[in-house]
């Protein structure tokens, strides 16, 4: 997928974390249960 940033950005977070994408990970999600 592609994201374009420019005149506006919804990436900013109100928390103390940075709004940039976190480092990539190969981790897969397991179903709960």
């Amino acid at each position: 997928s592609e994201t374009t940033t420019g005149t506006s950005s919804n990436s900013s977070q109100s928390t103390s974390n940075s709004g940039l994408a976190p480092n990539p990970t190969n981790a897969t999600t397991k179903a709960a249960g």
């Epitope: 592609e2 940033t5 950005s9 103390s16 940075s18 709004g19 940039l20 480092n23 990970t25 190969n26």
Partner: antibody
Amino acid sequence: QVQLVQSGAEVKKPGASVKVSCKASGYDFTGYHMGWVRQAPGQGLEWMGEINPITSDKTFNQKFKSRVTMTRDTSISTAYMELSRLRSDDTAVYYCARRDYGTSLDYWGQGTTVTVSS
Amino acid sequence: DIQLTQSPSFLSASVGDRVTITCRASKSIKKYLAWYQQKPGKAPKLLIYAGSTLHSGIPSRFRGSGSGTEFTLTISSLQPEDFATYYCQQHNEYPIIFGQGTKLEIK
């Protein structure tokens, strides 16, 4: 040690395309986004965008969205940036830079000079 | 987009001097500001990230401080190898933006 080695200088005519490569070594290529930054002669730094090497997701600077293509080949730990419809004001040094979530652009390639001239 | 304004644009100083460069953001970027050093013909080098954290291998004479919209880079005692151009860069949100640079010259 982390190293990013870029392809050599290019001279292109207006309207042409250029493709710059960036070969990574010394770390897990898929563990960090790869960004691209350019610097026109005597000017400052301008972020063009970045690619996620695992998913190939990209985030672009609006200014370059219609002309830039970012790809990667994880089998050879190499990222590519192609800029099309070149103009004289695209003459610049183009850098790849690893982006770590915590530290930002922590390691940079040596730069590739692209000259656009008729 | 966020705008980053560095001041001064040019700075003349002598070896041993203490110098301070300021970077102001047009809106809060929390602590997420990085500083880079660039010498002519070379790639930028990361000095400081997250406002105040020294990158590995960077001498302790470099110090970053600030949060929100105002940040400073201080070099406590200038060495000959410190004369270069310095850029701030926000890493809080997209698009990633750099300041216009501060050229530090020998007086």
